[in-house]
């Protein structure tokens, strides 16, 4: 019988008492084979973290700063359940740390030196740790003691709780730096008042502060937010303009063997029986003998943290950067305006080799990071381990939901002004063998299908979106008799046709021979009935253009396209016989790297792009003999996006809507994790 006990860690006598009450009340409402609570008392949160890591306890609820400590080695804990605030319909699990300024003040985030600052309090998250952590490398040296460096950075501050004797500049705007509400500029509302009164130029608070202090929209319109990309936005656009997104209060557990499902089962049942307004005799979110015991008194319930979400992703790049800067105190030698090398994310072995060659030829401008799947690459870009990669539109959607931005688009048509003219897109098509003359769009059920990969545009999102509208369910593996859709569950019939050996079978990378456009077409040639690819795939792999043994004798005339009206047409008639127009692949990055990725990639394509005529000895960025490594092989150039610089604008309303509809069929654990952070 598996042990269904969750050992909760308590950090005080009062918490231990509440924990025992929690244990006893859960016993009275949960069947004997259900989860139960045991209580472990420790002296501090850090002791609880260590106890969980050592398997002496299982769970504790922590604020964001401690979630960071819990994640660090050797603890390696992960977030498993989040408290939420507000309503069940609109649950808030995060708040946003923001920098508020007056509308007419005219400076940006990178011009804060010499300004007057208002803080909620020394050592507090939104008011000190996050802004000072993010500004850390701009502070004058020596950066220790930190208070002195901050005092020398701003021309005057109010940082309640600071030592006014040692650091008088930190108390210049609020004499005495009182550490309670007796100081009119203390806390969130106080820091905002400091700005409002004209004492300071910028207030570091949380996103709700301005709404709580100014009920009138006209009054709020006198203020703006400073964004990390050195722009400003209205105060209600805090989701797109903040210093960091911070989780409020989170249950953590071990990453391996951490009982996360059991902890969720326990807390989910606990909130059903003892949550807000559920029971008089015991209340989960109430602390008669103290404040915020075990859980925050202001919490309204719990939400399960998606399993794909580790602490780094949960806390977010900006928060982790800020806290790491403060804790480790390391900065690059001399901060310069020059761009650091761009860390390109390469998928598996073959892309890594091409990336390495690019790195050697770029003489240090490009560095390479490897991952096994596109989603792993996106996650690495999110957390700063990598900076950029080029993605199919379906993954541009996921990357966008995860906060990344498109920066350049692949262009596939030769034109005089390639880099200035992003194209409308390519065509997603369904290809069949000419010999299978009875096959049409309307009788694909039970046939064998070949897909570039799950989540990709031409190979999945477009055909499966159209199919979903027809069959109204997500069981595509039952619709087709078998197929190869790399990235499917290994036991799915949509992995049956794949050719990868061992663990590489059905993997969404080049280790699976039927991966990508060329792979899906090869799958059709060798085993399948229909391949979902781009309109250029057939001509690129027939007529001797692909020298590989399986392709060298293929003839374009032996293949036809399925049209949505139930007819068929020759391959060259794709403009009148396609499933949909697909957005071109695009390079994505984090917002903070946008300018540098843009600059370095434009330099790189001038050196190694389509202007290189002999690829036998020279490095060619857009060539890999039909393997589409790093970029599509038919890329002519990387084009500026102009104003299409968000994933929604880049992909277009129609495609975003189509992928949104297919979301209910999504198996993307990353998309689930990212929509948890930003629903």
């Amino acid at each position: 019988v598996p042990d269904k006990t969750v050992r909760w860690c308590a950090v005080s006598e009062h918490e231990a008492t509440k924990c025992q009450s929690f244990r006893d009340h859960m016993k009275s409402v949960i069947p004997s084979d259900g989860p139960s609570v045991a209580c472990v008392k420790k002296a501090s949160y850090l002791d609880c973290i260590r106890a969980i890591a050592a398997n002496e306890a299982d769970a504790v609820t922590l604020d964001a700063g401690l979630v960071y400590d819990a994640y660090l080695a050797p603890n390696n804990l992960k977030p498993v359940v989040a408290e939420f605030y507000g309503s069940k319909e609109d649950p808030q699990t995060f708040y946003y740390a923001v920098a508020v300024v007056k509308k007419d003040s005219g400076f940006q985030m990178n011009q804060l030196r010499g300004k007057k600052s208002c803080h909620t309090g020394l050592g507090r998250s939104a008011g000190w740790n996050i802004p000072i952590g993010l500004l850390y490398c701009d502070l004058p040296e020596p950066r220790k003691p930190l208070e002195k460096a901050v005092a020398n950075f701003f021309s005057g501050s109010c940082a309640p709780c600071a030592d006014g004797t040692d650091f008088p500049q930190l108390c210049q705007l609020c004499p005495g730096c009182g550490c309670s509400t007796l100081n009119q500029y203390f806390g969130y509302s106080g820091a905002f008042k400091c700005l409002k009164d004209g004492a300071g130029d910028v207030a570091f608070v949380k996103h709700s502060t301005i709404f709580e202090n100014l009920a009138n929209k006209a009054d709020r319109d006198q203020y703006e937010l400073l964004c990390l990309d050195n722009t400003r936005k209205p105060v209600d656009e805090y989701k797109d303009c903040h210093l960091a997104q911070v989780p409020s209060h989170t249950v953590v557990a071990r990453s391996m063997g951490g009982k996360e499902d059991l902890i969720w089962e326990l807390l989910n049942q606990a909130q059903e029986h003892f949550g807000k307004d559920k029971s008089k005799e015991f209340q989960l979110f109430s602390s008669p003998h103290g404040k915020d015991l075990l859980f925050k008194d202001s919490a309204h319930g719990f939400l399960k943290v998606p399993p794909r979400m580790d602490a780094k992703m949960y806390l977010g790049y900006e928060y982790v950067t800020a806290i790491r800067n403060l804790r480790e105190g390391t900065c690059p030698e001399a901060p310069t305006d020059e761009c650091k090398p761009v860390k390109w994310c390469a998928l598996s072995h073959h892309e890594r080799l091409k990336c390495d060659e690019w790195s050697v030829n770029s003489v240090g401008k490009i560095e390479c990071v490897s991952a096994e799947t596109t989603e792993d690459c996106i996650a690495k870009i999110m957390n700063g381990e990598a900076d950029a990669m080029s993605l199919d539109g379906g993954f541009v959607y996921i990357a966008g939901k995860c906060g990344l931005v498109p920066v350049l688009a692949e262009n596939y048509n030769k034109s005089d002004n390639c880099e200035d003219t992003p194209e409308a897109g390519y065509f997603a098509i369904a290809v069949v063998k000419k010999s299978a003359s009875d096959l049409t769009w309307d009788n694909l059920k039970g046939k064998k299908s070949c897909h570039t990969a799950v989540g990709r545009t031409a190979g999945w999102n477009i055909p499966m979106g159209l199919l979903y509208n027809k069959i109204n369910h997500c069981r595509f593996d039952e619709f087709f008799s078998e197929g190869c859709a790399p990235g499917s569950k290994k036991d799915s019939s949509l992995c049956k046709l794949c050719m990868g050996s061992g663990l590489n079978l059905c993997e969404p990378n080049n280790k699976e021979g039927y991966y990508g456009y060329t792979g899906a077409f090869r799958c059709l040639v060798e085993k399948g009935d229909v391949a979902f690819v781009k309109h250029q795939t057939v001509p690129q792999n027939t007529g001797g253009k692909n020298p590989d043994p399986w392709a060298k004798n293929l003839n374009e005339k032996d293949y036809e396209l399925l049209c949505l009206d139930g007819t068929r047409k020759p391959v060259e008639e794709y403009a009148n016989c396609h499933l949909a127009r697909a957005p071109n692949h695009a390079v994505v990055t984090r917002k903070d790297k946008e300018a540098c990725v843009h600059k370095i990639l434009r330099q790189q394509q001038h050196l190694f792009g389509s202007n290189v005529t002999d690829c036998s000895g020279n490095f060619c960025l857009f060539r890999s003999e039909t393997k589409d490594l790093l970029f599509r092989d038919d890329t002519v150039c990387l084009a500026k996006l102009h104003d299409r610089n968000t994933y929604e604008k880049y992909l277009g309303e129609e495609y975003v809507k189509a992928v949104g509809n297919l979301r209910k069929c999504s198996t993307s654990s990353l998309l689930e994790a990212c929509t948890f952070r930003r629903p």
Epitope: L353, V360, N510, S616
Partner: nanobody, 117 residues
């Protein structure tokens, strides 16, 4: 068929030096970017140093200032001079010729470098 034969490995004490060679045949050596990779026990393959056809070089951070990559196009040979060797440099070293274009996987048998006192 490309053939790459590495030599020059051996056992050396920390702080010591070795010079690895890689003889290439059947490749378009003189116009290809070349590189040295290594694989430590239980670890993945990692790029150590690379050299372009024009002689521009690039090194992984941990070997910068200690290792030097060079090529002799007349002899179709690639070299890696390794100085101030450390225990963490212990690995099998392979050379590769990028003209094979990333997926034919032409690798030699490698040469083992062991740094130990």
């Amino acid at each position: 068929e490309v053939q790459l034969v590495e030599s020059g490995g051996g056992l050396v004490q920390p702080g010591g030096s070795l010079r690895l060679s890689c003889a290439a045949s059947g490749s378009i050596f003189s116009i290809a970017t070349m590189a040295w990779y290594r694989q430590a026990p239980g670890k993945g393959l990692e790029l150590v140093a690379g050299i372009t056809r024009s002689g521009s070089t690039n090194y992984r951070d941990s070997v910068k200032g200690r290792f030097t990559i060079s090529r002799d196009n007349s002899k179709n040979t690639l070299y890696l001079q390794m100085n101030s060797l450390r225990a963490e440099d212990t690995a099998v070293y392979y050379c590769t010729d990028y003209s094979s274009r990333y997926y034919h996987d032409y690798w030699g048998q490698g040469t083992l470098v062991t740094v130990s006192s």
